[in-house]
Interface confidence: low
């Protein structure tokens, strides 16, 4: 009853959604196969081949625990742990091996359980080259005299839309938050719309190191102001890493419950479902842009 969520790595285990109901069960990924006969070649990497009417389904029943023990895959993506890497290999029916313990050096900030759906593939892995890892959309300028991470984020022309960020600073537009994050090479999140006020407390905001590894920066309990702490969002405790597959985990202390704030294009309780039905509109240079 109080074991870590999920189970051990590897295949097997029952999925509540049942056969083929992958939309209701994020742990069961089903891949349609063109081959009409179940054999070793039609369902590899730990998948279970199942005949389903005229076609086949390759069920990847991996019950992966959600602990953040990142590994870098041979496809250049960071996986939350080795089980997620194996599950991705099964899901896509392609070989993915562990090429490094720890996250891939990348600026895409993926690190999710399904890292293969983010980033740009193998070229990401050693993108840092001489620069060291450039994150938060920074690019390595190897031709520059002082080799380093360069930020080419252009925020000129953005409309005035002030926000309060996790570093306690106010920015005139969300774009400037991204720019600051890029320049400082550290995670800075938008806390709320509008300028920061005296009541804003940054002690609970935490920082995001790699992917879904949200770490509360709170060093002792006395720093936690009650008015912020109870009934408001705080970063999820570390043993909930991976609770949100494609989104940010937020924890409401008064209810002791986590909720997921999904990234654009994802939905579901754990932001595990791809949602192409939503048209996202964001302000950009005085005009509306479809994302």
């Amino acid at each position: 009853s109080n074991q870590p969520p999920g189970g051990g790595g590897g295949s097997g285990g029952d999925c509540p959604g049942g056969k083929g109901k992958s939309i209701n069960c994020s742990e069961l990924n089903v891949r349609e196969s063109d081959v009409r006969v179940c054999d070793e070649s039609s369902c590899k990497y730990g998948g279970v081949c199942k005949e389903d009417g005229d076609g086949l389904k390759c069920a990847c029943q991996f019950q992966c625990h959600t602990n953040y023990i990142p590994v870098c895959g041979s496809n250049g993506d960071t996986y939350q742990n080795e089980c997620f890497l194996r599950r991705a290999a099964c899901k896509h029916q392609k070989e993915i091996t562990v090429i490094a313990r720890g996250p891939c050096y990348s600026d895409n900030g993926s690190g999710s359980g399904e890292g293969e759906e983010e980033g740009s593939g193998a070229e990401v892995h050693r993108k840092h080259s001489k620069c060291g890892p450039c994150k938060y959309k920074a690019e390595c300028d190897e031709d520059a005299e002082n080799v380093g991470c360069v930020c080419n984020i252009d925020c000129s022309g953005y409309s005035f839309n002030p926000v309060c960020a996790s570093d306690g600073s106010s920015y005139n537009n969300p774009c400037f938050v991204r720019e600051a994050s890029c320049i400082k090479q550290e995670q800075i999140d938008i806390r709320h719309l509008g300028h920061c006020t005296d009541t804003d407390d940054t002690s609970l905001l935490g920082k995001k190191d790699d992917g879904l590894q949200y770490r509360p920066d709170v060093k002792d309990a006395s720093d936690q102001r009650e008015d912020v702490y109870i009934g408001n969002h705080m970063p999820c405790p570390e043993n909930l890493n991976g609770y949100c597959i494609h989104g940010k985990c937020e924890f409401i202390y008064s209810t002791q419950k986590a909720s997921c704030r999904c990234e654009s294009g994802y939905t579901g309780q754990h932001c595990e479902k791809t949602d192409f039905s939503i048209l996202y509109v964001v302000p950009s240079r005085q005009k509306l842009t479809h994302v």
Partner: antibody, heavy 124, light 107 residues
Framework: QVQLQESGPGLVKPSETLSLTCAVS?????????WGWIRQPPGKKLEWIGS???????YYNPSLKSRVTMSVDTSKNQFSLKLSSVTAADTAVYYC?????????????????WGRGTLVTVSS | DIQMTQSPSSLSASVGDRVTITCRAS??????LAWYQQKPGKVPKLLIY???TLQSGVPSRFSGSGSGTEVTLTISSLQSEDFAVYYC?????????FGGGTKLEIK
């Protein structure tokens, strides 16, 4: 079977620093859970000292925070407690324990596994 | 800090009796409460968490109920091995705090 075992000196002089270590066997502390320290003065109730995660994130009891330092050594699968400037009031049985984990988006900060406890006496 | 007050502080009962121990919180704690049993010279043992969820391996004669500021632990039919000190602990808010304990003795 997961087991926790405290170790450290049973006698500490006033104003010195109390140092205890908790060795965990049967479970990798890097795999999850928070790990805590609780103490119990003779004949008195339990008092939470603080908790630590394998990354080093700590949560301390405000009443002790100025004197407490907790650390973790994942390579040795152990975590430690240091309590500085001790007085006779710090005489207690010190327990290390595993805190309940988060599941289904809900966290349970109770203690499901305890070490045997070690009596630390502060006396000159 | 949230203060946890247990009542009674001591209780005498006989084998087979039904016993109820109450834990009151100085402010609402929802159901974020655990109960522990501690025998003399022994380590505290988790009995119940989330106010009413029985920890694995704990006999079903133990049960918990309530939420908010008042939570109770009930032992439906006392056994000789149940005589011990019982502590409640809230985990709705840091710092985590324990009750003063209820000593359950043989009448």
């Amino acid at each position: 079977q997961v087991q926790l075992q405290e170790s450290g000196p049973g006698l500490v002089k006033p104003s010195e620093t109390l140092s205890l270590t908790c060795a965990v066997s049967g479970y990798s502390i890097s795999s999850g859970y928070f790990w805590g320290w609780i103490r119990q003065p003779p004949g008195k109730k339990l008092e939470w000292i603080g908790s630590i995660y394998h990354s080093g994130s700590t949560y301390y009891n405000p009443s002790l925070k100025s004197r407490v330092t907790m650390s973790v050594d994942t390579s040795k699968n152990q975590f430690s407690l240091k309590l500085s400037s001790v007085t006779a009031a710090d005489t207690a049985v010190y327990y290390c324990a595993r805190e309940g984990d988060c599941s289904g988006g809900i966290c349970y900060w109770y203690f499901d596994l305890w070490g045997r406890g070690t009596l630390v006496t502060v006396s000159s | 800090d949230i203060q946890m007050t247990q009542s009674p502080s001591s209780l005498s009962a006989s084998v087979g009796d039904r016993v109820t121990i109450t834990c009151r919180a100085s402010q609402g704690i929802s159901n974020y409460l655990a109960w522990y049993q501690q025998k003399p010279g022994k380590v505290p043992k988790l009995l119940i968490y989330a106010a009413s969820t029985l920890q694995s391996g704990v006999p079903s004669r133990f049960s918990g109920s309530g939420s908010g500021t008042e939570v109770t632990l009930t032992i439906s039919s006392l056994q000789s091995e149940d005589f011990a000190v019982y502590y409640c602990q809230q985990y709705n808010k840091w710092p985590l705090t324990f009750g003063g304990g209820t000593k359950l003795e043989i009448k």
